[in-house]
């Protein structure tokens, strides 16, 4: 009972002076509030609240249920309690039976007793099962009991309050605890495609899937930079305790070109937030953009081998290729494949092996592709590098000596006289005329060259060589001069092979 | 014990708005989940969403997405429904119930709020 | 959504007969299922949690049983007290309710 100080108010007093106070179930409960300014008197007990205007509380036949806390208050707002116990054997146990943790929190699971004097007050297992090793209580009889730092492994525990009454055993009605997890990450945001790609009408739809440990987290689609709500649908399951999933899916039933953007799948919790986005392009029809990925100009030396190659984007998918030199298809050396096996991907790869190429297949090689929107085409310009090839070499009714050479690049004749027997021929010698003669003819093949010179400068015996070059190599024709008398003669000419 | 104590009934016009309380005595509140039913006449009954006090973030039935927002009060231990753009076929009596979020069952039920839409 | 199905949606049955109402899911609930008695003009209540678990207070005629998309409640001697509506009710995804079963006297 509080003690008096003179000259400041003083709580209440209370009949019988006493904290607690048992009574037996159906005797009477008599409290005298002693106070010039009383106002009320209140029980609590679950939760529950009872008030009463008169100073004094009388319960005639007492019940279990009037086990509890009364307390008097005065008009100062000081107040005094008396706890007082109903013993009831057949009810020991008042209880509340919904029992809600929230993880590494305390919780009290709410069976006060009726009987102060009971021993062994804890929890026990339903069914005789034991409890969680590591779950610990605390008991009060005025209260319940305490489980300290409710653990996840603890959701969906059966228990009991217990006590021994008279060397028995006595259990409460069961309880269930449900554990409220504690959010410890941020919920895990994953998109069903980082980017799509869409012609104007046709239908956008990305699923964001959000993974949690309760269905309380929070999850949007929110398009970036724009404050517009977003029509969205969602699934979503339990896969098992503390394991929950969503899936919100964004739709776009008929796609514009300004619906273009970043959509971002957003999420948050009570720890945290997370996001992921995808990239929407809508374009308002189909394309196909070709890349080479060597120069469209080749020059490959004869006998080589060439991979013509190109890249290309195409939206939407490819339906048909092909390659095509002098009107005429391949229908194999190619192959066509997409860069990579991502399910967005619209960028491809098409090749043309062309093998010991011969100086006549140089040309044009086009690649040609088509989709349900457009077509497109690219042109690679082939030549065939060529060692020269000594044509004709003649001496002319003119008294001229002709050599006419085909190669590639353009051959250059050059003409040397050796005289007598030497094998070296130093001596150069000025043509008298060099035509190419096939300038103005297809732009792809050997080029042709003609050379002259006058055979009537040359005085002595001795060889005449006629030699064509270009960046390939060089080949040689040769001429042999005899005089007999004032007679020159030709002997038979021939070539020789020089690399 | 624990009781629900719901709203009482209410008659709106098409178009209009409703909001339908639900008070806890006793228990921790804030950790239960609240969730709201409904049941037309003759009719089966309809989760319609629901909230855990503690998390504050409320989970909606699809069919009620956008139309439907529930709340909690959690000094007042009030959980709240309002249903918006009312049509005639939302008469329905609107239960509201312990349970119903993260596997929990519907333990504790309200007695329940009539709402009668008609012009 | 998961779907539930309820069967019968009504039966006759007399006092101490032994009813059977069966639900079954669109897809696997695993034990994600109650089952709820209501009577007219009153609030639902709380028969069986987690398939097979009974209620506290509730008699022990009522039992449970099944998992993942079949289900069963069993009344093994019907009481007066038993005319009611039957609902079951699925927790793993967005909450469905069955049909409800409606048990009336024979």
């Known amino acids: 009972q509080p003690s008096v100080s003179p000259g400041e108010p003083s709580p209440p007093s209370i009949h019988p002076a006493k904290s607690e106070l048992i009574v037996r179930v159906g005797n009477e409960i008599r409290l005298l509030c002693i106070d010039p300014g009383f106002v009320k008197w209140t029980f609590e007990i679950l939760d529950e609240t009872n008030e009463n205007k008169q100073n004094e509380w009388i319960t005639e036949k007492a019940e279990a249920t009037n086990t509890g806390k009364y307390t008097c208050t005065n008009k100062h707002g000081l107040s005094s309690s008396i706890y007082v116990f109903v013993r009831d054997p057949a009810k020991l146990f008042l209880v509340d039976r919904s029992l809600y943790g929230k993880e590494d929190n305390d919780t009290l699971v709410r069976c006060p007793l009726t009987d102060p004097e009971v021993t062994s007050y804890s929890l026990k297992g339903c069914q005789g099962k034991p409890l969680p090793k590591d779950l610990r209580f605390v008991p009060d009889p005025k209260a319940g009991i305490t489980i300290k730092s409710v653990k996840r492994a603890y959701h969906r525990l059966c228990l009991h309050c217990s006590a021994d009454q008279e060397g028995k055993s006595v259990l409460s009605d069961k309880f269930i605890l449900k554990v409220r997890p504690a959010f410890k990450a941020v919920p895990v945001v994953s998109v069903s495609k980082a980017s799509y790609l869409l012609r104007e009408g046709e239908e956008f739809t990305v699923t964001c899937t959000i993974k949690d440990v309760s269905s309380s987290v929070y999850s949007t689609w929110k398009r970036e930079n724009s404050q517009t709500k977003l029509q969205e649908k969602y699934n979503s399951w339990h896969h098992g305790d503390f394991n929950y999933e969503r899936q919100a899916t964004l739709t776009i039933s008929s796609a514009r070109v300004n619906d273009s953007g970043v959509f971002m799948c957003y999420a948050n919790n009570t720890f945290g937030s997370a996001n992921v986005t995808t990239t929407l392009e809508v374009v308002d029809k189909g394309f196909i953009n070709i890349f080479p990925m060597i120069n469209t100009t080749v020059f490959v030396n004869d006998g080589e081998n060439v991979d013509l190659i190109v890249e290309y984007e195409a939206f939407p998918k490819p339906e048909h290729q092909q390659w095509i030199y002098m009107n005429r298809t391949f229908t194999d050396k190619w192959e066509d494949y997409p860069k990579s096996e991502n399910e967005s991907n619209i960028r491809y790869v098409s090749e043309l092996h062309l093998t010991r190429l011969k100086g006549t297949e140089g040309g044009t090689y086009t690649f040609l592709v088509s989709n349900s929107d457009v077509n497109a085409s690219i042109a690679f310009n082939v030549y065939v590098n060529t060692k020269p090839e000594i044509l004709t070499y003649d001496r002319l009714v003119n008294g001229m000596l002709q050599c006419v050479a085909a190669g590639f690049p353009e051959p250059t004749i050059d003409w040397y006289f050796c005289p007598g027997t030497e094998q070296r021929c130093s001596a150069s010698v000025l043509p008298v005329d060099v035509q190419t003669l096939n300038a103005s003819g297809p732009p792809f093949g050997k080029l042709v060259v003609q050379s002259s010179i006058d055979s009537s400068a040359f005085k002595h015996n001795g060889t005449v060589e006629c030699k064509a070059y270009n960046d390939v190599g060089k080949t040689s024709a040769y001429f042999n001069f005899a005089f007999k008398g004032n007679n020159k003669e030709q002997i038979h000419p021939h070539t020789l092979f020089t690399p | 014990q624990v009781q629900l104590v719901q709203s009482g009934a209410e008659v709106k016009k098409p178009g209009s708005s409703v909001k339908v309380s639900c008070k806890a005595s006793?228990?921790?509140?804030?950790?239960?989940?609240i969730s709201w039913v409904r049941q037309a006449p003759g009719q089966g009954l309809e989760w319609m969403g629901g909230i855990i006090p503690i998390f504050g973030t409320a989970n909606y039935a699809q069919k009620f997405q956008g139309r439907v927002t529930i709340t909690a009060d959690e000094s007042t231990s009030t959980a709240y429904m309002e249903l918006s753009s009312l049509r005639s076929e939302d008469t329905a009596v609107y239960y509201c119930?312990?349970?119903?979020?993260?596997?929990?069952?519907?333990?504790?039920w309200g007695r329940g709020t009539l709402v009668t839409v008609s012009s | 959504d998961i779907q539930m199905t309820q069967s019968p949606s009504s039966l006759s049955a007399s006092v101490g007969d032994r009813v059977t109402i069966t639900c079954r899911a669109s897809?696997?609930?695993?034990?994600?299922l109650n089952w709820y008695q209501q009577k007219p003009g009153k609030a639902p209540k709380l028969l069986i949690y987690a398939a097979s678990s009974l209620q506290s207070g509730v008699p022990s005629r009522f039992s449970g049983s099944g998992s993942g998309t079949d289900f069963t409640l069993t009344i093994s001697s019907l009481q007066p007290e038993d005319f009611a509506t039957y609902y079951c009710?699925?927790?793993?995804?967005?909450?469905?309710f069955g049909g409800g079963t409606k048990v009336e006297i024979k």
């Open positions: 006793g228990g921790t509140f804030s950790s239960y989940a």
């Open positions: 897809q696997s609930i695993n034990s994600y």
């Open positions: 009710q699925q927790g793993v995804s967005d909450i469905t």
């Open positions: 119930a312990r349970g119903g979020l993260d596997t929990d069952e519907f333990d504790l």
